[in-house]
Amino acid sequence: AVNGTSQFTCFYNSRANISCVWSQDGALQDTSCQVHAWPDRRRWNQTCELLPVSQASWACNLILGAPDSQKLTTVDIVTLRVLCREGVRWRVMAIQDFKPFENLRLMAPISLQVVHVETHRCNISWEISQASHYFERHLEFEARTLSPGHTWEEAPLLTLKQKQEWICLETLTPDTQYEFQVRVKPLQGEFTTWSPWSQPLAFRTKPAALGKDT
């Protein structure tokens, strides 16, 4: 939902978390605000307190249950409201009928590890975290490798158009320090976006053997 300088954006991690950001220019910094979730076919309601993340934006996480519990499905609609304290009452600032599986952003991949490393190549694996079983294999990944003297923004993106939780990096330089990141996105959902990047995995290629061509 957008109106002038106000915006209310939420994403579902596919299991038990809805993360929301509320931004409004000129809003009072010390105002107490919260997000309230009211599902259309569930018996629970949930609230989280919006905390400032910048001069004019606030964020919070609606924790719907245990991290790996499947709290919502493709048919659920959750009415989300931003409520801010105004004197003695709570004023509704923003409202939306949120379709969780149209607004997905998964957790960053975890457990990155080097499976095998050589002079010119490195095999890396990872795991997805708190991803719904509904996706089956309908996920894609992007990966990037940080080379010496470059920035993450300059790193070319490697696209994996299937649920493949490993990659073999090739044409690497021997005895060189690299970093690697990966992110994940379900194929489902009109407003679905990429997960955050994983924590970087640092690795070093093996030195070239003395007296041999490299």
């Epitope: 939902a1 509704v92 409202i95 009928d97």
Partner: nanobody, 126 residues
Framework: EVQLVESGGGLVQAGGSLRLSCAAS????????MAWFRQVPGMERELVAA????????VYRDSVKGRFTISRDNSKNTVYLQMNTLKPEDTAIYVC???????????????????WGQGTQVTVSS
């Protein structure tokens, strides 16, 4: 502040029609969705219909679907409720409401609305 003034209520025979109007004045630039609620003494106020800022979205309570139509003329700062095939159970005070909340829902509740009119009485006789 926003002021809302309703008109068009009255006494009508069952099966008849009425058109309610709600004129908004004041800080109307802040208004987004508008709605009609109704209240019978001793009962909770209930949503009849709501309409989005641009008129592109609307929602109705089940019991009035196909009989009532909500519309909006932003050039006149007015919202209308056309009520056809009226029934005795439609008898109530009809109240106009406006909200500053951005966005839209099919599940509006009374606390979503910041501004309220005084209401206009609609009586449907059998």
């Amino acid at each position: 502040e926003v002021q809302l003034v309703e008109s068009g209520g009255g006494l009508v025979q069952a099966g008849g029609s009425l058109r309610l109007s709600c004129a908004a004045s004041g800080s109307i630039f802040s208004i987004n969705a508008m709605a009609w609620f109704r209240q019978v003494p001793g009962m909770e106020r209930e949503l009849v219909a709501a309409i989005s800022r641009d008129g592109g979205a609307s929602v109705y309570r089940d019991s009035v679907k196909g009989r009532f139509t909500i519309s909006r003329d932003n050039s006149k700062n007015t919202v209308y409720l056309q009520m056809n095939t009226l029934k005795p159970e439609d008898t109530a005070i009809y109240v106009c409401a406006a909200t500053r909340a951005i966005g839209w829902t099919a599940r509006w509740i009374t606390t979503d609305f910041d501004f309220w009119g005084q209401g206009t009485q609609v009586t449907v006789s059998s």
